[in-house]
Interface confidence: low
């Protein structure tokens, strides 16, 4: 039960995270014009990974895309690439994790296969989250560097000697969305990896021996003893040693040296 809950929660958290990464990538507010000491009160500039916008005091907003590819800074291209890789990996991870969910039965898929798929999706979510966090952090670093450079230029430029100064841009909402989303995807991935450990059938050097008495079923496992009566909740005589995942009907697939009736 705990494994199913962990896996399900990991899936939901990752789903929210990846939705957030997609939202952040599409958002225009990656950098917003720093309004501190800014004489232009009529307009407000903000920029995203794909286009830049200007909002007037009237509320009208005009956006234009970056129609060139070669002219854009390498750092911006790198951020775009990281975010897209994050989205693609996350999307594949989601697809894999849907089939890996314990609550969904697909044919006669073994628990070991589900465990492998859960681990795969978990790793994909972790890498996806790291890509998003890295992308947003690279952009934030680019902004911080640019902010202080342009602050220096601004004060030297106001004297009329330097004729070009750079507008100062600060963190936009998309950066915070990206950081949170990346973190959620990362946490979801870790949860999936934890769930994988619970899903994987425990392998022992010795085959467990099952003793069946009339009306009672007792299962022994090397390294410990668990018993359950044939009456009550365990009416199907589930073997305790593998977490109750298989019924007694499935014993035939695991022949033992000693079968007692």
């Amino acid at each position: 039960m705990a494994v199913t809950a962990c896996q399900g929660l990991g899936f939901v958290v990752s789903l929210i995270g990846i939705a957030g990464i997609i939202a952040a990538t599409c958002m225009d507010q990656w950098s917003t014009q720093d309004l501190y000491n800014n004489p232009v009160t009529a307009v407000f500039n903000y920029q995203g990974l794909w286009r830049s916008c200007v909002r007037e005091s009237s509320g009208f907003t005009e956006c234009r895309g970056y129609f060139t590819l070669l002219g854009l800074p390498a750092m911006l291209q790198a951020v775009r690439a990281l975010m897209i890789v994050g989205i693609v990996l996350g999307a594949i991870g989601l697809l894999v994790s849907i089939f890996a969910l314990k609550c969904i039965r697909i044919g006669s898929m073994e628990d070991s296969a589900k465990a492998n798929m859960t681990l795969t999706s978990g790793i994909m979510f972790i890498v996806s989250g790291l890509c998003a966090i890295a992308g947003v952090s690279v952009f934030a670093n680019m902004l911080v560097t640019n902010f202080w450079m342009s602050t220096a230029n601004m004060y030297t430029g106001m004297g009329g000697m330097v004729q070009t100064v750079q507008t100062r841009y600060t963190f936009g909402a998309a950066l915070f969305v990206g950081w949170v989303a990346g973190g959620l995807t990362l946490i979801g991935g870790v949860m999936m990896c934890i769930a994988c450990r619970g899903l994987a059938p425990e392998e022992t050097n010795y085959k467990a021996v099952s003793y069946h008495a009339s009306g009672h079923s007792v299962a022994y496992k090397p390294g410990g003893f668990k018993a359950s009566t044939g009456f009550g909740s365990n009416t199907k005589n589930k073997k305790i040693y593998d977490g109750g995942a298989r019924t007694e009907d499935e014993v035939q697939s695991y022949p033992s040296k000693h079968d007692y009736v």
């Epitope: 950098s31 014009q33 232009v40 009529a42 307009v43 500039n45 920029q47 830049s52 916008c53 200007v54 007037e56 005091s57 009237s58 009208f60 005009e62 234009r64 895309g65 970056y66 129609f67 060139t68 002219g71 854009l72 800074p73 911006l76 640019n146 342009s150 430029g157 004729q163 070009t164 100064v165 750079q166 507008t167 841009y169």
Partner: nanobody, 121 residues
Framework: QVQLVESGGGLVQPGGSLRLSCAAS????????MGWYRQAPGKQRELVAT???????NYADSVKGRFTISGDNAKNTVYLQMNNLKPEDTAVYYC???????????????WGQGTLVTVSS
């Protein structure tokens, strides 16, 4: 490199008129906000008027009703029609442009060299 070239400054009597123009060249502009700022001797640079690429204008309270800003998007030029000039309008007038070119991810503030407007009798 983007260049802003101003023209039209000079000496004018109080109550007179002047028309300043500023032409931007050297870049393809994706979004532009252009305008005029002025700096009187010993004072800070202050906003006179701005105009966006869509034509929305913004004026300093001291020039409202006397100055008119207009722009020509095709020529990347901004004009400042100054009427009923007063001695306190005497200053160096700087052309300003906040332009984002496809090659500039960050918007750039460009300033002209400035043109002197003297209002005196």
């Amino acid at each position: 490199q983007v260049q802003l070239v101003e023209s039209g400054g000079g000496l004018v009597q109080p109550g007179g008129s002047l028309r300043l123009s500023c032409a931007a060249s050297g870049g393809i502009f994706s979004i532009g906000v252009m305008g005029w700022y002025r700096q009187a001797p010993g004072k800070q640079r202050e906003l006179v008027a701005t105009i966006t690429s869509r034509g929305s204008t913004n004026y300093a309270d001291s020039v409202k009703g006397r100055f008119t800003i207009s722009g020509d998007n095709a020529k990347n030029t901004v004009y400042l029609q100054m009427n009923n000039l007063k001695p306190e309008d005497t200053a160096v007038y700087y052309c300003y442009a906040d332009l984002i070119r496809p090659g500039d991810f960050y918007g750039m503030d460009y300033w002209g060299q400035g043109t002197l407007v003297t209002v005196s009798s």
